[in-house]
């Protein structure tokens, strides 16, 4: 387990001519906030695919009102880091999406209107526990500067946060077979053990007490083969000749529930109803108390002071089950109305509303967008009684019908050649220059002129520029 941390340093106009208009005005003051979405691996998935590693939303930035006639400056930012906790191992390679959102503070019906101002995405390699990595990304005429890192939460350590450490019991050395935990040399590695009963063939874990299934297996203990679509029977071992699943014993056959528990089949496996004083998947555990730490995912244990009395886990938001072991998919309840996109950010739900709707659950119909379509993927934004379009990359105009030439503003510095690309533009730099816009000269000694260190980093600190 650990935390991915993102520090936004600046969001404002990119270099070169064609500076964007300020997103806020005297009539429509606004403030910015950011959303980060993380996915494991070097995925090329669509922006709307699940943020499997996690997502986070920043606080709102200070209210900003454009000064008439002034160019858009770097916009005021929210305080603090965006933090995305991850429960499992850090994958090492990941994809990110960072969205800059504008919250308009005019007197809209149903509260403030949100619109997406810019979206940047990338794929990176990053070891947990390393220094801050620095990045610059551009979306249209906007430029976003940020740093990020992944760090493990104790007791996890290592580049993937898969090793567990615990304080040494003796000052001299760790027990047999247990290594000191670099860089925490005063701590010792602790064993990681999966949930009791997790199949040794088909299950593994990256958190104590969990059971994750290898491909082709399912169920709480990874003992149930996944059905193949070409076969009728959902159970049993695979037939070597057909590759299909042949009928096998049911999950309750032979009653897997110990100590007088009663078994009932579930769609994916079985469930035991245990008599008083027994707990666990198969009622195999007796006398569990709060001292045994039975509540997962930060659940609060109450009662159970003596082995004969049951404990109760009070689960934090987002988790349920008798031991808070199940993650709640709060979006499955479809809380966003009118076709809004549901975002489960862990600490809160957010609805991203379709054009023409607003409100925390997209419950407000904004009439001024009704029947007024924005072309080429643009989003209609309610704006004080008049419809406006927030256009997708590469388009402009009132209704996003005008194709914008991303190279028209000559964005490539130092003689770099500009090529229009479906996702924006690409610069081919002249010899001796580098960077997304050819803005950095390559020094003869091999170093490059790079931007200054982010706040909190001294120039001498180790850092990485991507």
């Amino acid at each position: 387990a650990g935390v991915f941390e993102l520090q936004i340093h600046s969001f404002g106009p990119g270099p070169g001519p064609g500076a964007p208009r300020s997103p806020c005005s005297a009539r429509l003051p606004c403030r910015l906030f950011f959303r980060v979405c993380l996915k494991p691996g070097l995925s090329e998935e669509a922006a709307e695919s699940p943020c499997a590693l996690g997502a986070a939303l920043s606080a709102r930035g200070p209210v900003y009102t454009e000064q008439p006639g002034a160019p858009a400056p770097d916009l005021p930012l929210p305080d603090g880091l965006l933090q995305v906790p991850f429960r499992d191992a850090w994958p090492g390679t990941f994809s990110f999406i960072i969205e800059t959102w504008r919250e308009e503070l005019g007197d809209q019906i149903g509260g403030p209107a949100w619109s997406l101002l810019a979206r940047v995405a990338g794929r990176r390699r990053l070891a947990a526990g390393g220094p801050w990595a620095r990045d610059i990304q551009r979306a249209g005429a906007w430029e976003l500067r940020f740093s990020y890192r992944a760090r493990c939460e104790p007791p996890a350590v290592g580049t993937a946060c898969t090793r567990l450490c615990r304080p040494r019991s003796a000052p001299s050395r760790c027990g047999p077979g247990l290594r000191p935990c670099a860089p925490l040399e005063d701590e010792c590695e602790a064993p990681l053990v999966c949930r009791a009963g997790c199949s040794p063939e088909h299950g593994f874990c990256e958190q104590p007490g969990e059971c994750r299934c290898l491909e082709g297996w399912t169920g709480p203990l990874c003992t149930v083969p996944v059905s193949t679509s070409s076969c009728l029977s959902p159970r049993g071992p695979s037939s070597a000749t057909t590759g299909c699943l042949v009928p096998g014993p049911g999950p309750c056959d032979g009653n897997p529930c110990a100590n007088g528990g009663s078994c009932s089949e579930t769609p994916r496996s079985f469930e035991c109803t245990c008599p008083r004083g027994f707990y666990g998947l198969r009622c195999e555990v007796s006398g569990v108390t709060c001292a045994d730490g039975p509540c997962f995912n930060g659940g609060l244990c109450v009662g159970g002071a003596d082995p004969d009395s049951a404990y109760i886990c009070h689960c934090p938001p987002g988790f349920q089950g008798s031991n808070c072991e199940k993650r709640v998919d709060r979006c499955s309840l479809q809380p966003c109305r009118n076709g809004g996109l549901c975002l489960d950010l862990g600490h809160a739900l957010r609805c991203r509303c379709r054009a023409g709707f607003a409100g925390p659950r997209c419950e407000h119909d904004l009439d001024d967008c009704a029947g007024r379509a924005c072309a080429n993927g643009g989003t209609c934004v309610e704006g004080g009684g008049a419809h406006r379009c927030s256009c997708a990359l590469g388009f402009g105009g009132r209704d996003c019908r005008e194709r914008a030439d991303p190279c028209a503003a000559r964005p490539c510095a130092h003689g770099g050649r500009c090529y229009a690309h479906f996702s924006g533009l690409v610069c081919a730099c002249a010899p001796g220059y580098m960077g997304a816009r050819c803005e950095f000269p390559v020094h003869p000694d091999g170093a490059s002129a790079l931007p200054a260190a982010p706040p909190g980093l001294r120039p001498g600190d180790p850092q990485r520029y991507l």
Epitope: T162, P191, V193, A196, H202, F204, E206, E215
Partner: antibody
């Protein structure tokens, strides 16, 4: 179907280094959660765990033999290699490789084993 | 390291009888204990894991019980193919260790 097969020399001289290879099929060490380990068994004696390596290159060694053992993997070749330095006649044993999943430190699937004799 | 002590060293029984094998840990291993069966010239085979869960394809006559430091493998009615050496192994801590084995032989 998962199979594991050990290969290497059958006879090693004292002080020499033993190199054993486990070649497996039916799974990949690029799969998250998967590992391969080595266990040995002197003739007529008990099993002794030696080393483990996992998909994320995490390596575990028996503390009593840690200074003599090195375990590595060649993921594209579906192979795990164990080297054991400074061999001694007491290291005469059948050496097995077996699959073990991360956090689930049992050995569900085994190779047939290879007998290594240490003698001058 | 955790030491696993198996008893008896040798158990002589006849087919159809009930066999009870013991494994004792030098400190608690919770329920994280497995049993393996090994026949002459063959690799060990996982029978029971986490004290009482039967591995894939293991007949119902094999059962396990116990937790903490004392564990038992029971074979309810011995078949001729059950005569072999049985080992216990824990997974609760590093290093992984095995017991010294119990030989189950035909009386």
């Amino acid at each position: 179907q998962i199979t594991l097969k050990e290969s290497g020399p059958t006879l090693v001289k004292p002080t020499q280094t033993l190199t054993l290879t486990c070649t497996f099929s039916g799974f990949s060490l690029s799969t998250r959660g998967v590992g391969v380990g080595w266990i040995r068994q002197p003739p007529g004696k008990a099993l002794e765990w030696l080393a483990l390596i996992y998909w994320n290159d995490d390596k575990r060694y028996s503390p009593s033999l840690q200074t003599r053992l090195t375990i590595t993997k060649d993921t594209p070749k579906n192979q795990v290699v164990l080297t054991m330095t400074n061999m001694d006649p007491v290291d005469t044993a059948t050496y097995y490789c077996a699959r073990s999943n991360w956090g689930n430190w049992y050995f569900a699937l085994w190779g047939r084993g290879t007998l290594v004799t240490v003698s001058s | 390291e955790i030491v696993l002590t198996q008893s008896p060293a040798t158990l002589s029984l006849s087919p159809g009888e009930r066999a009870t094998l013991s494994c004792r840990a030098s400190q608690s291993v919770s329920s994280y204990l497995a049993w393996y069966q090994q026949k002459p010239g063959q690799a060990p085979r996982l029978l029971i894991y986490d004290a009482f869960y039967r591995a894939t394809g293991i007949p119902a006559r094999f059962s396990g019980s116990g937790s903490g430091t004392d564990f038992t493998l029971t074979i309810s009615s011995l078949e001729p193919e059950d005569f072999a050496v049985y080992y216990c192994q824990h997974r609760s801590n590093w290093p992984i260790t095995f017991g010294q084995g119990t030989r189950l032989e035909i009386k």
